[in-house]
Amino acid sequence: QQQTLPKPFIWAEPHFMVPKEKQVTICCQGNYGAVEYQLHFEGSLFAVDRPKPPERINKVQFYIPDMNSRMAGQYSCIYRVGELWSEPSNLLDLVVTEMYDTPTLSVHPGPEVISGEKVTFYCRLDTATSMFLLLKEGRSSHVQRGYGKVQAEFPLGPVTTAHRGTYRCFGSYNNHAWSFPSEPVKLLVTGDIENTSLAPEDPTFPADTWGTYLLTTETGLQKDHALWDHTAQNLLR
């Protein structure tokens, strides 16, 4: 006899990285017929939804109008059908960005390299932080973590055309509070024609569309849970 229902899916719209004072909606998708959903923050009850009519609703939304460091952290949700509760969802790490300062991102030997060259990114922030994050813009939000007193280095090793794209970095004050994003650095990797044509390049964005990137990146993936890429989320843990 089944003692618990399958776990629901949890995600953030438009993105799990939320600039401070901006709004975000945490979505929880369970089953039709669920009479109650509970959202938990850092292990404690945060909000409750009792959808009506339950038989016509399988997803609820918890709105956060004003993102700040107190709202940043780990969320999970559960739902109930009759008296039977579900397993808890995976953890959603909600991150507040645009805190305090802006780091500087540089790349060595330079932004234009040949396939096979060793490339290292450097992220520098003079204020009190020791953790840095390097993100490649695109649908899968590749995230790398680095450490250093005022600067972290991110060696990519010998690059291929798959490394092409636009990069930004953040200083991290804790796992869920990040700095403003750095200015973008576009890495151009040249190789032979065959490699270039086969390279799985992520979509990139002009320098002034970082806000749009935050609003659009992974939204489609978050709604299609079979494709959801947990790379960034897992790196936060």
Epitope: Q23, A47, D66, M71
Partner: nanobody, 130 residues
């Protein structure tokens, strides 16, 4: 400027009843989830009850379930907490609170965490004693 003003507190004997009111001005009250919290002397603030903006969902702390009833009148911009079968351990300052932001809240959602609330009243003291 947002203002939340509680009233209705006072001294009551164990087993008695009180009705607290919370009048809200400066916000579009009718689309905002509301909550009641309390803080007893020397203790942390704790959740008491919450209500969705449509009144379709209410939620209570286990300690008050079956004794307290939260309600609201959107036409009067007022939320209420009806407290029956009061006990000595209900003695506390009671605060009403409203969530922040715009009008995008689901009609059936309530918030139980104090951190979810942006605006707070000054509190009204409820003393249960014989």
């Amino acid at each position: 400027e947002v203002q939340l003003v509680e009233s209705g507190g006072g001294l009551v004997q164990p087993g008695g009843s009180l009705r607290l009111s919370c009048a809200v001005s400066g916000r579009t009250f009718s689309r905002l989830p509301m909550g009641w919290f309390r803080q007893a002397p020397g203790k942390d603030r704790e959740f008491v009850a919450a209500i969705s903006w449509s009144s379709s969902t209410t939620y209570y702390a286990d300690s008050v379930k079956g004794r307290f009833t939260i309600s609201r009148d959107n036409s009067k911009n007022t939320a209420y907490l009806q407290m029956n079968s009061l006990r000595a351990e209900d003695t506390a300052v009671y605060y009403c609170a409203a969530v922040g932001g715009s009008l995008d809240y689901s009609a059936t959602v309530v918030y139980t965490a104090a951190r979810a609330y942006a605006d707070w009243g000054q509190g009204t003291l409820v003393t249960v004693s014989s």
